[in-house]
Interface confidence: low
């Protein structure tokens, strides 16, 4: 609901005449840029030459709103672009999985106080790249070969580990047969069971496998680190507060 109100307010701001007379700021943009189809590109604008406070930045493609970065509410990506648009870096915008249809003008609209609105223009051209296609033709068989090699290696390792365990199990069985019979009623730990409490293999924020060989403390730190990253990425946009 608040985003609906914000969008209405933003449109109003866009059409409103500037209240202040003198605008000293300039917008620096990445200018005219080109990128390959299927790739990604960062659109960046920077407002300089002014001490005005930025309250909101709108990113628009022709007449479509892509995203809003509001000082209080943070980022909002337009639902129709959610899958392909990522906020940042900074007040910039990252466009992913580019198509030829993405070719065109992009605008960064800075709403500032007391200056008013500044607009920067970027022209993006998305190219059909024969080089990219040529590279892909070589990459696919290569990836296939690598994957096959990996599967063979993993299979070999699993077989060796299984045989080693079998031998150990036979030795243990012959020596400790009586003990095993005595404790047959007790539940045995199985490798498929969830990791015991305190284990960090299941730390949601950290990528799987990073903590396999590490001590608990290290993994806790890593978990915290990734939580900090996700917290920062969910935070408000980077708007300035004058501290001088």
């Amino acid at each position: 609901m608040r985003w609906c109100l914000l969008l209405i307010w933003a449109q109003g701001l866009r059409q409103a005449p500037l209240a202040s007379g003198m605008m000293t700021g300039t917008i620096e943009t990445t200018g005219n840029i080109s990128a390959e189809k299927g790739g990604s590109i960062i659109l960046q604008c920077h407002l300089s030459s002014t001490t005005a406070q930025v309250t909101q930045v709108n990113w628009e493609q022709q007449d479509q709103l892509l995203a809003i970065c509001n000082a209080d509410l943070g980022w909002h990506i337009s639902p129709s672009f959610k899958d392909r648009v990522a906020p940042g870096p900074g007040l910039g915008l990252t466009l992913q999985s580019l198509t030829v249809n993405d070719t065109g003008e992009y605008f960064c609209i800075y709403h500032t106080y007391p200056d008013g609105t500044y607009t920067g223009r970027i022209f993006l051209e998305v190219l059909e790249s024969s080089v990219a296609e040529h590279g892909a033709r070589f990459q696919i068989p290569l990836l296939g070969a690598m994957a096959a090699t990996l599967v063979v290696i993993c299979t070999a390792v699993i077989v060796v580990v299984a045989l080693t365990r079998k031998k150990k199990a036979l030795r243990i069985h012959s020596v400790e047969g009586d003990l095993r019979r005595k404790s047959a009623g007790q539940e045995e730990w199985s490798p498929s069971a969830p990791s015991p409490p305190g284990s960090c293999v299941q730390a949601e924020a950290a990528p799987a496998g990073l903590c396999g060989e590490q001590r608990g403390e290290d993994c806790a730190e890593l978990h915290d680190y990734f939580n900090v990253l996700s917290y920062r990425s969910l935070g408000n946009c980077s708007f300035f507060t004058e501290t001088g």
Epitope: S48, F239, E242
Partner: nanobody, 118 residues
């Protein structure tokens, strides 16, 4: 913690030169926009010059051709070379950095006083 420390200010005669330095710490200097602003007694703070991450420079009309902004990424320091100084350049000069971190954008130094007088 972001820190900006200006130095190089002082008293200089009209037509003279000064070089201001801004030592930065607590952030990735090479990916941050840097600028110089100034505030004369009884006036509002105004833009002087800036250098973007791509190396593009901007100048206020009043200092164009006389002042030069530069940055040394290896030393995490921004500079403002001021030549042909005029009495109207007298002000406290502030270094500013736009840091993409948390909810703070523009960070300011404490300022260094430049006095142009005979």
């Amino acid at each position: 913690e972001v820190q900006l420390v200006e130095s190089g200010g002082g008293l200089v005669q009209p037509g003279g030169s000064l070089r201001l330095s801004c030592a930065a710490s607590g952030f990735t200097f090479s990916t941050s926009w840097m600028g110089w602003f100034r505030q004369a007694p009884g006036k509002e703070r105004e833009f002087v010059a800036s250098i973007s991450t791509s190396g593009n420079t901007f100048y206020a009309d009043s200092v164009k051709g006389r002042f030069t902004i530069s940055a040394d990424n290896s030393k995490n320091t921004a500079y403002l070379q001021m030549n042909s100084l005029k009495p109207e350049d007298t002000a406290v000069y502030y270094c500013a950095a736009d840091v993409w971190y948390g909810s703070t954008w523009r960070n300011w130094g404490q300022g260094t006083l430049v006095t142009v007088s005979s």
